[in-house]
Interface confidence: medium
């Protein structure tokens, strides 16, 4: 793997759990300042595989609020605005990292957790299984 | 708001930076064990708005590898397999949290960072601006 030279100004790591337990600064640095300002928030409605968004809140998690996509239809919307069941609306899922308070209710102690979230939906050609 | 009673077994928080700086256990707990085993990995190819996946690696970030979706076409694939430019392929983006080594090259000190990633693409009806 890539070996990174250690910075001599690093915090002390005498903790017996090191490197399992690390210090994390929660002042979030947002790298999204130069992103395309074109809003994607209406795609859920304009897509041929539209979706609804549902709010999931958990005060023991950071971020505490995550929005989950649920596809509206099994099929996709065709040019006439009708659902075409020859195509499938499917969720696009992504694994994301969140922080889980551990022990529970502790304000300054967390564990990394990986969760699968549905971000939106896309329209796919179904896999047809032909029975011999 | 919701007041969570503090757990008496919480780690000490005398750090002068508290609550900005917290302890995080990097042993990831994976909550995805009960998710549908049906793989979504082939959707990028079967979608009417197909995408390519590009590997983004940064050893100063955790996770160090993130896959970014780039839509293959401006339009969407129609029933004949051709690109229909009356529709638009657009990226579905999500803000995710990552850990950034801070100071740089430190193995046990991080800062939370928010980045915008494209997870996949969806096919949308374009917004047509009529000029008077």
């Amino acid at each position: 793997g890539i070996t990174i030279p250690r910075n001599p100004g690093c915090p002390n790591s005498e903790d017996k759990n090191f490197p399992r337990t690390v210090m994390v600064n929660l002042n979030i640095h947002n790298r999204n300042t130069n992103t395309n300002p074109k809003r994607s928030s209406d795609y859920y409605n304009r897509s041929t595989s539209p979706w609804n968004l549902h709010r999931n809140e958990d005060p023991e998690r950071y971020p505490s609020v995550i929005w989950e996509a649920k596809c509206r239809h099994l099929g996709c919307i065709n040019a006439d605005g009708n659902v075409d069941y020859h195509m499938n609306s499917v969720p696009i899922q992504q694994e994301i990292l969140v922080l889980r308070r551990e022990p529970p209710h502790c304000p300054n102690s967390f564990r990394l957790e990986k969760i699968l979230v549905s971000v939106g939906c896309t329209c796919v050609t179904p896999i047809v299984h032909h029975v011999a | 708001g919701i007041t969570i009673p503090r757990n008496p077994g919480c780690p000490n928080s005398e750090d002068k930076n508290f609550p900005r700086t917290v302890m995080v256990n990097l042993n990831i707990h994976n909550r995805n064990t009960n998710t549908n085993p049906k793989r979504s990995s082939d959707y990028y190819n079967r979608s009417t708005s197909p995408w390519n996946l590009h590997r983004n690696e940064d050893p100063e970030r955790y996770p160090s590898v993130i896959w970014e979706a780039k839509c293959r076409h401006l339009g969407c694939i129609n029933a004949d397999g051709n690109v229909d430019y009356h529709m638009n392929s657009v990226p579905i983006q999500q803000e995710i949290l990552v850990l950034r080594r801070e100071p740089p090259h430190c193995p046990n000190s991080f800062r939370l960072e928010k980045i915008l990633v494209s997870v996949g693409c969806t096919c949308v009806t374009p917004i047509v601006h009529h000029v008077a």
């Epitope: 809003r39 809140e57 | 708001g1």
Partner: nanobody, 125 residues
């Protein structure tokens, strides 16, 4: 969960203005899209205006466009409805609400799970 309390209602002459406020208690106000609805005596509750989580996107019913403005201040956990050129038909109880799902339209009442108790607006001619 979020609790909502409206204020700023009252009696006003036709053509006058009012600013309604909706104060939220809850640590995650910034993560709720918000809306204003109103209910006149003997009528159904109806959508008036809505605003996105960040405040950079809003929507209005046709009958209030150009007269009402929705805004929010996430630092103060408050959403506002600035009403101008008020008409007697604007008389109603005004409610603010927090949205917990998106089912395609801003005005879909079932998307709003948390409601305030309402504030009365009376416009006299």
């Amino acid at each position: 969960e979020v609790q909502l309390v409206e204020s700023g209602g009252g009696l006003v002459q036709a053509g006058g203005s009012l600013r309604l406020s909706c104060a939220a208690s809850g640590r995650t106000f910034f993560s709720y899209p918000m809306g204003w609805f109103r209910q006149a005596p003997g009528k159904e509750r109806e959508f008036v205006a809505a605003i996105s989580m960040s405040g950079d996107d809003s929507a209005y019913r046709d009958f209030v466009k150009g007269r009402f403005t929705i805004s929010r201040d996430n630092a103060r956990d408050t959403v506002y409805l600035h009403m101008t050129s008020l008409k007697p038909e604007d008389t109603a109880i005004y409610y603010c609400a927090a949205r917990t799902s998106y089912n395609g339209r801003y005005d879909y009442i079932d998307d709003y799970s948390y409601w305030g108790q309402g504030t009365q607006v009376t416009v006299s001619s």
